[in-house]
Structures are given as C-alpha cells and as structure tokens.
C-alpha cells in the first residue's frame, strides 16, 4: 500500500512542534504513523515531503516568521532542518495581514525518522484544514 | 498510462472558476479530462494536486487576495476547498506590485470528482504559462 | 533505480545560472547528472520539478525579484521558461527583509534536456541548504 500522509491544522496546538489533525476531514494516513506532532517513517526510501503554514494577524508588527520541516532520529544528537522558510518586513505596520509559507522537496528518509513542523510564532498561525497542512508520500 | 495534467493560464476569460489552456505550449493532459475549467478524475486513487497563481497590479491598494483549489462532485451538495492561500497587506500603497501563491498536496480523489481553481480577483491575475498553472498526477 | 535529484544552495555561485551543492549534506543525485548548474535528463518521461529560493537583504529597496526554472536543449535555439515567480513591492523601504519563492510542477522532459535555475539578483540570495534548493524526480 502507498505510504502517504496529509495532516491538517489543529487549532489546539499549544507548543512546538505543531500538532496535527490525523483523523477527521481531508486527512490521509497510510503506511506512516503519527505520534505527538510527528510523522514516523517505517520504511527507508525516497519521500516527497511538503508543508504549508498560513500566518495572519490583526495588526502588523512584522514579527519575523519562520516555518521549518525538520527531522529527528534517536541515532542523531541534533534535529536536522530539511526545509525552511523565513519572512521579515512583509506587511504594513498596523494593518490586518495574512501570508502563507510553502515548502516541498524530496528526501531520503530512514525507518524511525520522525518529521515535524515548527513555526516561530504559534499565535499567528491559522489552522484551517485548507490553509495549514503537512504531508508526504513515498516515491 | 500515467494520469497527469499540467494546464497553463488562459488570459481571455473572465469567468470563475479559472479556465485553462489545455492544448498548446507546455501543457500535459493524459488520463484526465478537462471540462469548463475543471480537471475531471476518472480513476479513484491518490493524487498530488498543485497550482500557482501570479497576481500583479499597477498600483497597490492591498486588495485581499485568495487562491483556492476546490473539488465538486454531484454526490455532494457543496464544494470542498482542498487548499487555499490568502494574502492581505502585501505591498506598498500606490506601487506596482507582483506576488505568487503556490499550493500543492496529496488527496484521495474519486472517479467523477471535478477539480477547479478560484481566485478572489481575476483582474489581478497574470496568465503567462510559466507563472500561472494547475496540475496533478496520480501517485 | 528511481531518477531523482535534490540539490542545495552553493554560496560561491558568482554567475547565472545558479550553481548547486551536489555532494554534501542532504543532497540526492541518482539517475540524473549534474553539470555546471544544470540537471541533465538522461531518460525521457514525466518529471516533477521544483525549486525554492530564499531572498533576503539588509535594507529593503524593493528591487524586483525573479526566480525561474528553465530548460535548454541543443535542438532548440532558445531557453524555455518552465516556471517563474516574480516579486515587486514586497517589503518596507529601509528595513531588513526576507522572502521565499517556491515553484513546482510536472513536465514532459526529453533525454539531454538541461534544467537550470535563474534569479534576477544573485546578491540577495541566501544559500542555506534548507532554504534554497532545486530538485526533481521521475514519476
């Protein structure tokens, strides 16, 4: 069976990494496990990994924004940042604003790798399922 | 044969959903039908769906922009928004501006699903084939 | 073996097209050759091609930014722009700024096609491996 995941925003995320909806709506989870915000790889191979995060706020103060997909494996001491997007000076001071960050690329993943998404400012993330998501599929 | 589509911007249309070039240029259409702006799925399965829209204008007034990929099926009463990007407060008032929105993710699609792209303001879309496009492929 | 590439930013790029790290880090190169900034296709077929470029600067002057993936083949006299992103009026004058451009789509590529990435302003590109990359895989 095709190894695939598409998880959507979960608005009760309170800490990093982001947590995801893995059951309801347009979610997919097949041949990959979801555990505490992470997608857990159980078969080594090539995967296309992607994520989109929708940032928005009532009054722009140009707080620097970052959106990272990173990997953790018990064999390695440190997280590996696979993909990252950063934004600075992106809106007009005081105005209501909205902006997305999209990441997607191919990686060679190993069984037991855990993949997570991190953002710099949780309070500025909107978690609508169509707007903020995290997924992958095995090539 | 691989089920795949890559359609490019078609500039002489004023209707929603967006209409697409399905014949000339860098277009691909194989195992999927194109009908009145929509990609029509004829085989149930997992698909990676993507779209990019290039917005631009002569004089920025920060009109809110949205870019949606949505699905319609006669079995369901309402359109399902699969992916969406929104932008607010994205340029300096009065200046010439340009910005893109990119969406891409995996979905489980069913035979007879129709996929479309919608934008909030058609007048601000540039339809160059390299800039505005809509595609998918079956995993 | 799966034909796949994921190349990351190389900070000693001095000219166009961009040059890429093809050996160290989270790089992948299998069944595709890398030559002077280009990915060289050796088997005709359908490929998903993607690139992200991270632009940033110390003091915003809203220099127009462009990010292109283009194709060159000795059979054709001219480069073919496959995908392109443009940005104008994207930051507040004088401020430190940062912004990404992401492109990704499916193309029918032919053996001996060379794929490259071009940007309008090399001095504004940040080449961190997680931020600026170029890849593809055969469907």
């Amino acid at each position: 069976l095709r190894k695939v995941a598409h998880l959507t925003g979960k608005s009760n995320s309170r800490s990093m990494p982001l947590e995801w909806e893995d059951t309801y709506g347009i979610v997919l989870l097949s041949g990959v496990k979801y555990k505490k915000g992470g997608l857990v790889i159980n078969e080594t191979g090539l995967y296309f990994v992607y994520s989109k995060v929708y940032f928005r706020g009532q009054s722009c103060n140009n707080l620097p924004l970052s959106h990272k997909v990173y990997m953790r494996n018990s064999k390695y001491p440190q997280d590996l940042v696979m993909m990252e997007g950063k934004m600075m000076s992106y809106c007009t001071t005081g105005q209501m604003w909205a902006r997305s960050s999209y990441l997607g690329a191919v990686f060679n993943l190993t069984s037991a790798d855990h993949l997570y998404v991190n953002v710099s400012e949780l309070s500025l993330v909107n978690f609508e399922e169509s707007q903020t998501f995290f997924g992958l599929y095995k090539l | 044969l691989r089920k795949v589509a890559h359609l490019t911007g078609k500039s002489n249309s004023r209707s929603m959903p967006l209409e697409w070039e399905d014949t000339y240029g860098i277009v691909l259409l194989s195992g999927v039908k194109y009908k009145k702006g929509g990609l029509v799925i004829n085989e149930t399965g997992l698909y990676f769906v993507y779209s990019k829209v290039y917005f631009r204008g002569q004089s920025c007034n920060n009109l809110p922009l949205s870019h949606k990929v949505y699905m319609r099926n006669s079995k369901y009463p309402q359109d399902l928004v699969m992916m969406e990007g929104k932008m607010m407060s994205y340029c300096t008032t009065g200046q010439m501006w340009a910005r893109s929105s990119y969406l891409g993710a995996v979905f489980n699609l069913t035979s007879a699903d129709h996929l479309y792209v919608n934008v909030s303001e058609l007048s601000l879309v540039n339809f160059e084939e390299s800039q505005t496009f809509f595609g998918l492929y079956k995993l | 073996l799966r034909k796949v590439a994921h190349l990351t930013g190389k900070s000693n790029s001095r000219s166009m097209p961009l040059e890429w790290e093809d050996t160290y880090g989270i790089v992948l190169l299998s069944g595709v050759k890398y030559k002077k900034g280009g990915l060289v296709i050796n088997e005709t077929g359908l490929y998903f091609v993607y690139s992200k470029v991270y632009f940033r600067g110390q003091s915003c002057n809203n220099l127009p930014l462009s990010h292109k993936v283009y194709m060159r083949n000795s059979k054709y006299p001219q480069d073919l722009v496959m995908m392109e992103g443009k940005m104008m009026s994207y930051c507040t004058t004088g401020q430190m700024w940062a912004r990404s451009s992401y492109l990704g789509a499916v193309f029918n590529l032919t053996s001996a096609d060379h794929l490259y990435v071009n940007v309008s302003e090399l001095s504004l590109v940040n080449f961190e491996e997680s931020q600026t990359f170029f890849g593809l895989y055969k469907l």
């Epitope: - | 002489n12 249309s13 004023r14 002569q58 007034n61 809110p64 303001e121 007048s123 601000l124 | -």
Partner: antibody, heavy 119, light 111 residues
C-alpha cells in the same frame, strides 16, 4: 496613471440615439471590466451594464436591456455606450468606470458626459 | 435585485466631529470570504470616488479618517474627524450579484 476620458456633451431629440465614448489609458484595457453608470440631475447613481474587453462579453441592467448597447474597440482602448429610443427621462450624466472583474468596485471613473434629451 | 437603503438622507455635522453613515442591503451581500459592499464620495460636478471597498478596506490614497465596517446586510461608513473637504454625498454600492445597485446617497453637510 489610469485615465478614462469621455466624449463631450450631447443634445438629442426624443426617439433618437446617442453614442458616448470612453478612452482608457494607463492600464491593460483587456483585463478589467468597463461599466456604465448614469446619474439624472439631482438624483443618485444607476448602473447600466458592463463589458469585458478581453472577450467582448457583456451584461446589462434589465432596465436598459434592448435600449443600451455597450461595445469596445481594443485597438484604441475605447469603450462605447449607445442608448436608443431616447426619452426626456434619459437626460443624465453618463459615466464610464473601470471595474475589477470579481470584486466589481469602480476604482476609476471618467469625467462624465451630459446627455440632454429635449424636443 | 438587492435594494440598498442609506440613512440618514442628510447628516449635519460640524468640522472635527465624527460622522456615521449607514447602509442596509435587502439581503446579505457577504460570503465566507468577503462582504461585497463599496463606498464612494461624490462632490458637485465630479465623478464619484472610491473610498472603501469590500466593506472595510481603504482604497489607495484615501485618508485614514475614513473607515468601513459591517457584514451581512448592515454596513457603516465612519469619518472620524470631518474635514472641510469631506462635505459631499456618499453612496454605498453592492457587487454581490447583478444588477449592481447603489444606495440613494447620504448628504453630509456643514452644521
């Protein structure tokens, strides 16, 4: 900058026709609608219809269907509004306005053309 | 068609004071994304000028003392501190469907 320049004032007899022009400049003519809006003396604004120069498609207010015809000439970036079977109550200032397709607000206006219908 | 009703017909305000103009639609002009209501200012002998679009967004070049609010069928244009150049007629317009219709206008005059 965006400009819409209309033709001059007209005096017409009841039963006749009038054709008002609106020359656009400073933007891509084929990417925005042109609407026509009229204003009778001392009265409010009444939308008559729009045309999309890109493909020539148009829509009219039911109140003007059959009497108003909106056309464009892409080569000169000019829109036209012809109103036939004129009556005294058609005396008004006629404005052309650029309209965004989807949002449909009128962001740039012509200076107006006074059409007087009198015997 | 959607009927737009503005109130009051005339508003007498002193310079420096706040002015609040109302516009009611006969049915909802809002979607999940936007409220399709726009406000214009017209002075004698001039074409209308766009002030606010999509209920609350300030058009480029319009002073920040103008603001718009509302959703569904009830909308408000507020001028926080009237300047001499603000005395004019104000129209609301919807673009939710065809035909586009305008309110009958509110005249803001000097008290």
């Amino acid at each position: 900058q965006v400009q819409l320049v209309q033709s001059g004032a007209e005096v017409k007899k009841p039963g006749s026709s009038v054709k008002v022009s609106c020359k656009a400049s400073g933007y891509t003519f084929t990417r925005f609608d042109i609407s026509w809006v009229r204003q009778a003396p001392g009265q409010g604004l009444e939308w008559m219809g729009w045309i999309f120069p890109g493909d020539g498609s148009s829509q009219y207010n039911e109140n003007f269907k059959g009497r108003a015809t909106i056309t464009t000439d892409k080569s000169t970036s000019t829109a036209y509004m012809e109103l036939s079977s004129l009556r005294s109550e058609d005396t008004a200032v006629y404005f052309c306005a650029r309209s965004l397709i989807s949002t449909a607000m009128f962001d740039h206006w012509g200076q107006g053309t006074l059409v007087t219908v009198s015997s | 068609e959607i009927v737009m009703t503005q109130s009051p017909a005339t508003l007498s305000v002193s310079p420096g004071e706040r002015a609040t103009l109302s516009c009611r639609a006969s049915k909802s002009v809002s979607t999940s994304d936007f409220s399709y209501i726009h406000w214009y200012q017209q002075k004698p002998g001039q074409p209308p000028r766009l002030l606010i679009y999509l209920a609350s967004h300030l058009e480029s070049g319009i002073p920040a003392r103008f603001s718009g609010s509302g959703s569904g069928t009830e909308f408000t244009l507020t001028i926080s501190s009237l300047q001499s150049e603000d005395f004019a007629v104000y129209y609301c317009q919807h673009s939710r469907e065809l035909p586009r219709t305008f309110g009958q206008g509110t005249k803001v005059e000097i008290k």
